[in-house]
Interface confidence: low
């Protein structure tokens, strides 16, 4: 037999030769970070063939690293299901903890024995400085140094110093989440007012006031004979803007050129139709209505328009 | 590996401001936070504050509220710390380390001095 | 706050024998987790100060094994073994619990 087969789990004892006579049998021993597990056999003989009889490293088995058990609040987890060397063990935390440490430890194999690669990590509470303080408002446990993983703060605005009030745009409640990062950026408190929105040929029909602030919402519809050109539901936006923009009353014109209507007062504007003159966004005439200025429409009132400060 | 460079020696009057740069490198610079030292000469370590290098949270120490303003560039690793008013006690040497709150200052900076004098 | 002695403030020592310092607070630094927040670091002279031992008893990486940390609560101490010229300077103790406070310091000297 030419020479014996080579394992990765182990090794010949003693010194190959360049061949072996029938019947010679050669003994294996396993090799260092391995060790054996009987009843396996670990030897072999040069066959009549001139082939040696099957033997495998089956028998010897990695050395393993100690047993590491979960940190608290958190998990142990080897990669692999296994505490054998060349293998990783991942750490974990529990939803409101991070780890302290090495995520990954290595079991490595150092002479003879297998040992990590570092001390096992631990889960601590998730934690948060304190949130952003802001210009013009302030947060509920002020006096707080640390927050804890769900430890919530809300936002309120200052009393303003001017006759119109601070606004909280945003979300005024935040909480300590993971990574210690707070759930979303901190609010602002501003001053926000939009102007008094006129719509010519048509009246506000809620959202009364003065004033308009955040969030302030108003709603609209034309006189008869004219159809709104836009939304009918305005809300005061964060930039002192209405959004969607304050809609206009556009006359209804007749649906051809060829004669005018018989009526000379304004189209009717009943609900249940859906005619171009319908106050709510129907479908419209299917050609834009010229855009004038008829002489004689009543002005907004001086001073209606609410300048912003 | 990890290394915390800082900025060189300052000398201000008092009522000045001073800006302290600390650069990073050897690790991820948003996965940690740097927390900011001071020595004063001769004696022990003050801790001054700390900065999220990930979101830019910052938790400073009660005495210098007010004064003092940490800050981070991501896109360069570095992180800052001002301290505004200068007074003749604010002469130390002044560190910056990496660490969360709760946990170990395994890295430093080199230190920088400040020195405030009329 | 959470104030943090330590004793002796100067400890004069001889290469190759063991020294010992201690370190209080003034509340105790043991955590529900079962750690304690507590630090030792190193400065030596001309140099910044390095992490010794963290959570009360672990050597950080690279710390020679002369170097050990014990105590729980509010007393803890920090022992080496057999002292070395190289481990001269000033020993602060810290805790990292309640933000952080550093004890005054223990200078370290050869006889």
């Known amino acids: 037999c030419e020479e014996p087969p080579t394992f990765e789990a182990m090794e010949l004892i003693g010194k190959p030769k360049p061949y072996y006579e029938i019947g010679e049998r050669v003994d294996y021993k396993c090799k260092k970070g391995y060790f054996y597990i009987p009843p396996l056999a670990t030897h072999t003989i040069c066959d009549r063939n001139h082939t040696w009889l099957p033997v495998s490293d089956d028998a010897c088995y990695r050395e393993t690293c100690p047993y590491i058990r979960d940190p608290l609040n958190g998990q142990a987890v080897p990669a692999n299901g296994t505490y054998e060397f060349g293998y990783q063990m991942h750490f974990i935390c529990n939803e409101g903890y991070y780890l302290i440490g090495e995520e990954i430890l290595y079991c490595e194999l150092k002479g003879s024995v297998a040992i990590w690669s570092g001390k096992p990590p631990i889960c601590e509470k998730v934690l948060c400085t304190p949130p952003p303080k802001i210009k013009n408002g302030k947060h509920t446990f002020s006096e707080v140094e640390v927050f804890e993983y769900l430890d919530a703060v809300t936002y309120s605005c200052d009393p303003a110093p001017g006759p119109d009030p601070f606004s909280l745009i945003g979300e005024s409640t935040i909480y300590c989440g993971d990574n210690s990062v707070w759930s979303r950026a901190a609010p602002e408190c501003k001053v926000v007012k939009c102007r008094f929105p006129v719509v010519e040929n048509g009246k506000q029909i809620s959202g009364f006031g003065k004033k308009f602030y955040y969030k302030a919402t108003v709603m609209f519809e034309c006189d008869k004979g004219f159809y709104l050109d836009g939304s009918d539901t305005i809300v005061c936006d964060s930039n002192s803007t209405w959004d969607p923009p304050v809609p206009k009353c556009l006359k209804v014109l007749p649906p051809s050129s060829t004669k005018p209507p018989a009526l000379s007062h304004s189209v009717s504007t009943s609900s249940t139709t859906k005619s171009p003159a319908s106050s709510a966004s129907g479908p419209r005439p299917t050609y834009k209505p010229p855009v004038s200025n008829y002489p004689g429409y009543p002005k907004p009132e001086e001073g209606i328009l609410d300048s912003l400060d | 590996q990890v290394q915390l460079v800082q900025s060189g020696a300052e000398v201000k009057k008092p009522g000045a401001s001073v800006k302290v740069s600390c650069k990073a490198s050897?690790?991820?610079?948003?996965?940690?936070?740097i927390s900011w030292v001071r020595q004063a000469p001769g004696q022990g370590l003050e801790w001054m504050g700390w900065?999220?290098?990930?979101?830019?949270?910052?938790n400073y120490a009660q005495k210098l509220q007010g004064r003092v303003t940490m800050t981070t560039d991501t896109s360069t690793s570095t992180a800052y710390m001002e301290l505004r008013s200068l007074r003749s006690d604010d002469t130390a040497v002044y560190y910056c380390?990496?660490?969360?709150?709760?946990?170990?200052?395994?890295?430093w900076g080199q230190g920088t001095l400040v020195t405030v004098s009329s | 706050d959470i104030v943090m002695t330590q004793s002796p403030l100067s400890l004069p020592v001889t290469p190759g024998e063991p020294a010992s310092i201690s370190c209080r607070s003034s509340?105790?630094?043991?955590?529900?987790?079962?750690?304690?927040?507590l630090d030792w670091y190193l400065q030596k002279p001309g140099q910044s100060p390095q992490l010794l031992i963290y959570?009360?008893?672990n050597r950080a990486s690279g710390v020679p094994d002369r170097f050990s940390g014990s105590g729980s609560g509010t007393d803890f101490t920090l022992k080496i073994s057999r002292v070395e010229a190289e481990d001269v300077g000033v020993y602060y103790c810290?805790?990292?619990?309640?933000?952080?406070?550093f004890g005054p310091g223990t200078k370290v000297e050869i006889k």
């Open positions: 380390a990496r660490g969360f709150p709760r946990t170990s200052f395994d890295s």
């Open positions: 050897g690790y991820t610079f948003t996965s940690y936070g």
């Open positions: 900065i999220s290098a990930y979101n830019g949270n910052t």
């Open positions: 509340q105790s630094l043991l955590h529900s987790n079962g750690y304690n927040y």
């Open positions: 959570l009360g008893s």
């Open positions: 810290m805790q990292a619990l309640q933000t952080f406070t």
